[in-house]
């Protein structure tokens, strides 16, 4: 029995749970998902039982062995997978555990602007980047382009301080998860701050 293997998949994609067996005389192999039997194989008996009909189209054995490939992944396929190799030549079954995380492909992140002030010709505000559907394990970074050096900022909130008369800047939020990344629409500092330009001490949401 080896250490737990962590696997990552994307919704609609496929993942293979690798299984290399050194057991010579295999009586049966049982794949389990969160304690529910998924597939039972009795190699000598030529028996392959896919327990639930809905999985019949999604299960495959890709490498001529006992590795399990699961296709058309859904979010609720995330969980603990377990395989037991049973043999009369073993005192106890050979086992392997896997943890599968299934992630969605990220849509375009949404950007909202916080309270804005314009003091002494400097526009100050926060930009907040978020996913509309509350996707898990998303990491946000900001790219600020346009000044002498392009800058990066980690985190979903970007504090902005831009002086009128400076060259315009473009802000882009990058959202990443283990299977994809996506970009917000670019936001121009000049456009963002135009609303506060008339009143040097204005604040707006």
């Amino acid at each position: 029995s080896g250490p737990v293997k962590e696997l990552v998949g994307s919704v609609g994609g496929a993942v293979t749970f690798p299984l290399k067996s050194k057991v010579k005389q295999v009586d049966s192999i049982v794949w389990t998902f969160n304690t529910t039997p998924l597939v039972t194989i009795q190699p000598e008996g030529g028996t392959i039982i896919v327990t639930q009909n809905r999985n019949r189209e999604r299960v495959d054995f890709p490498d001529g062995g006992y590795s399990l490939k699961l296709s058309k992944l859904k979010k609720n396929d995330s969980g603990i997978y377990y395989v037991g190799i049973y043999s009369s030549s073993l005192q106890q079954p050979s086992t392997q555990e896997y943890v599968l995380h299934v992630y969605e492909h990220l849509s375009k992140p949404k950007v909202t602007m916080g309270l804005q002030s314009n003091k002494n010709g400097t526009c100050v505000t926060n930009l907040t980047c978020c996913m509309e559907h509350g996707e898990e394990d998303v990491i946000y970074t900001w790219k600020a382009l346009g000044q002498a050096a392009n800058e990066s900022h980690n985190g979903s909130i970007l504090p902005i301080s831009w002086r009128w008369g400076e060259s315009d800047m473009t802000f882009i939020c990058v959202a990443r998860n283990p299977v994809s990344r996506n970009f917000s629409s670019p936001i121009l500092a000049r456009k963002l701050c135009e609303g506060a330009a008339d009143d040097p001490d204005s604040s707006m949401v």
Epitope: Q25, D27, G45, V59, F61
Partner: antibody
């Protein structure tokens, strides 16, 4: 791999066929039994694995028994309650794991008739 | 329901031609499928194991393939001695199962 002689049986009789193997150990290879009715296709009956586990086709489960004698290198098929539908040539073959059923006996004809 | 649907049931091919026999499984059976050739009065002979591996001593004109749950046996450059009945044998929920067989006749 060679099957024992078949022959003529009466309905309700019990069939006992022996498959004798040489050149390999039954502790390392499985043996399958297959039959073929005259003019028909091949039909799986059952298999005894290298560790002695037995598996049967659903139709054969209730009246078939496969056993082995590793010392004599023999595998025996016993089938009870014969009917005319059991008239067929019976084959045994070696199961070479992932490499399929690679060595077949010549087959033996079993006729069930009153 | 048939767990291994073999097509066609018979076919005729000229010497030097190509013939493809298909076997459709009712669910995924991975590589647990083999192909056999049987001539009248003889036992079956293993041609392909593990869906695509050529058995020892079998001519290279025999080729096994797989696409999902559909398996195929292709004979290229058919010879007179290839006249026979061909069977697929694969795993299933109920244990080993044979296809119904394909009779190949040489024109």
């Amino acid at each position: 791999v060679k099957e024992s002689e078949g022959g003529l049986f009466k309905p309700t009789d019990t069939l006992t066929l022996t498959c004798t193997v040489s050149g390999f150990s039954l502790n390392s290879y499985g043996v399958i039994w297959v039959r073929q009715a005259p003019g028909n296709g091949l039909e799986y009956i059952g298999i005894i694995g290298s560790s002695g586990n037995t598996y049967y086709a659903s139709w054969a489960k209730s009246r078939s028994t496969i056993t082995r004698n590793t010392r004599l290198n023999t595998v025996t098929l016993k089938m009870t309650s014969l009917t005319a539908a059991d008239t067929a040539t019976y084959f045994c073959a070696r199961y070479y794991g992932d490499s399929g059923f690679d060595s077949w006996g010549p087959g033996t004809l079993v006729t069930v008739s009153s | 329901a048939q767990v291994l649907t073999q097509t066609p049931s018979s076919t005729s091919v000229a010497v030097g031609g190509t013939v493809t026999i298909k076997c459709q499984a009712s669910q995924s059976i991975g590589s647990w499928l083999s192909w056999y050739q049987q001539k009248p009065g003889q036992p079956p002979k293993l041609l392909i194991y593990g869906a695509s591996n050529l058995a020892s001593g079998v001519p290279s004109r025999f080729k096994g393939g797989r696409s999902g749950t559909e398996y195929s046996l292709t004979i290229s450059g058919v010879q007179r001695e290839d006249a026979a009945t061909y069977y697929c044998l694969g795993a299933s929920p109920n244990g080993w199962a044979f296809g119904a067989g394909t009779n190949v006749e040489i024109k």
